[in-house]
Amino acid sequence: TQHGIRLPLRSGLGGAPLGLRLPRETDEEPEEPGRRGSFVEMVDNLRGKSGQGYYVEMTVGSPPQTLNILVDTGSSNFAVGAAPHPFLHRYYQRQLSSTYRDLRKGVYVPYTQGKWEGELGTDLVSIPHGPNVTVRANIAAITESDKFFINGSNWEGILGLAYAEIARPDDSLEPFFDSLVKQTHVPNLFSLQLCGAGFPLNQSEVLASVGGSMIIGGIDHSLYTGSLWYTPIRREWYYEVIIVRVEINGQDLKMDCKEYNYDKSIVDSGTTNLRLPKKVFEAAVKSIKAASSTEKFPDGFWLGEQLVCWQAGTTPWNIFPVISLYLMGEVTNQSFRITILPQQYLRPVEDVATSQDDCYKFAISQSSTGTVMGAVIMEGFYVVFDRARKRIGFAVSACHVHDEFRTAAVEGPFVTLDMEDCGYNIPQTDESTLMTGRA
């Protein structure tokens, strides 16, 4: 999921405690599948670094070999480095595992920016800061790769959490989460709280700070404020959803809603940016430019090349608009909206030329494969992937970066008619052409 960046991800990541936290609100919520309330053992189990992905610690094999694994809701393979590589501190050594089973089958996965290939097998897998279970799961042992692993990212593999339909080499390879649910009593649901730092983190800061939480099998109340609002999963391949309206500072972009979902809209933790179809991107940039016109920025900023910088601590957040995406609700003709701040869509990075200022990259970019709600969106929210009920929930994240004037928001209901018409029906073609390049 990659810069455009599809895999491996480029993200704006970081430490939960570093943003202002919102006060907890009380709310009544419907019953959920799975456990609710406190998942202390899983809270704060993610780490990450700006532009390089959120990862969780996992163990593979017997005796257990510990690896850091990128959490990716935009793919469906569990794949780990299994051979020496200059960017890997450690890798999965199958020969040392008494429980490894070879499937005698290869797998090749090309991305926009590189590729990996490997050998399929199964082994025992567990998540130390996750449910207290061990499962036998399919593992792609990566033996060769190009521009997949990232120098200094601190992760050695990828956990694809989407559905079997997009697994490689084909949909017969059961994804990890399916195996977990089948073999244990873990409910068919997980939730993610990705926490952006609000400023660039160096390697030691990343290791010392929290990147967020992946709650497996449930929902943790402490990770969000207000209510959870759910949107249906349109089709179980990627986590596909339907956007019905887009607003910049409350101004409707006024486009045919099909454009917002052309050719799909997905929620993808393995992509850094909010990626928008060409027409939507152009309209959104025009609107954001107009809203922030008190300052003029280089054209290269809007195109993702040039940074904008301000003297440390003087970023004029107030001149940038909020962005609202309206998502199809669970009830007929009802939608809800999620609103992100510039603190989410301006990604803190260091200027390679000078490091004294606060510099940012515009983290909204153009896509030819539909809308991708990447880390830029997810860092504002606690996101519940309720696979059991075929829906995705959004609530305001307790760790999102904001200021004293505005916070991210999840609000509803709104009346929206003919929302089904907003979905785009992809012509049935060879599924091998699926997007595997992300920014």
Partner: antibody, heavy 120, light 108 residues
């Protein structure tokens, strides 16, 4: 330190096309933009367009629009500039240059140049 | 598009003397202006970016100043290797990223 290595000199007939490559050795194109700049004999520098690999589309100078196509293959860290319907006034040295990672958009690394001669 | 006008077109200077090159933009480019040096048969080389910051490895005798529409490149004491053509370039409003017409610094 990244270097941009361009393909060799070309001699072309009017009306034909030329495709020049630019490979990043010792580094990647990811996160940077690659511009194409040309210089006719004894003339100044002319920016033709650029591409930000992974970001989507290329950007072109109006003068170049229509005849120039800029692409990139991130898997090989190579950018390409194709110029079609060649005429004698396209005879020039074509440079690729890198920018990005900073607020200023300066072209900090240049290829060695590729001489394209258009002659019947 | 933004037009960059460089003056003079040719500057004749003796080694050891100071050279002052000018670049005027048709509209404000903030500090998004760079200066390049080009010698015959070679690719351009970045000297100054952000109007006033020297690129890595560029000697201190090169300095840039200005913002908005008026910019200056100064070479405090010309060395023999400094005789070349100098171009300014803006990257504020683009496409296109325009270059100035160049100033040739020659030996007097």
């Amino acid at each position: 330190q990244v270097q941009l290595v361009q393909s060799g000199a070309e001699v072309k007939k009017p009306g034909s096309s030329v495709k020049v490559s630019c490979k990043a050795s010792g580094g990647t194109l990811s996160g940077y933009a690659i511009s194409w700049v040309r210089q006719a004999p004894g003339q100044g520098l002319e920016w033709m367009g650029n591409i930000i690999p992974g970001f989507g589309t290329a950007n072109y100078a109006q003068k170049s629009q229509g005849r120039v196509t800029i692409t990139a293959d991130e898997s090989t860290s190579t950018a390409y500039m194709e110029l079609s319907s060649l005429r004698s006034e396209d005879t020039a040295v074509y440079y690729c240059a890198r920018s990005g990672g900073t607020r200023y958009g300066m072209l900090d690394v240049w290829g060695q140049g590729t001489m394209v001669t258009v002659s019947s | 598009e933004i037009v960059l006008t460089q003056s003079p077109a040719t500057l004749s200077v003796s080694p050891g003397e100071r050279a002052t090159l000018s670049c005027r933009a048709s509209q404000s480019v903030g500090s998004n202006l760079a200066w390049y040096q080009q010698k015959p048969g070679q690719a351009p080389r970045l000297l100054i970016y952000g109007a006033s910051t020297r690129a890595t490895g560029i000697p201190a005798r090169f300095s840039g100043s200005g913002s908005g529409t008026e910019f200056t490149l100064t070479i405090s004491s010309l060395q023999s290797e400094d005789f070349a053509v100098y171009y300014c370039q803006q990257s504020f409003v683009w496409p296109p990223r325009t270059f100035g017409g160049g100033t040739k610094v020659e030996i007097k």
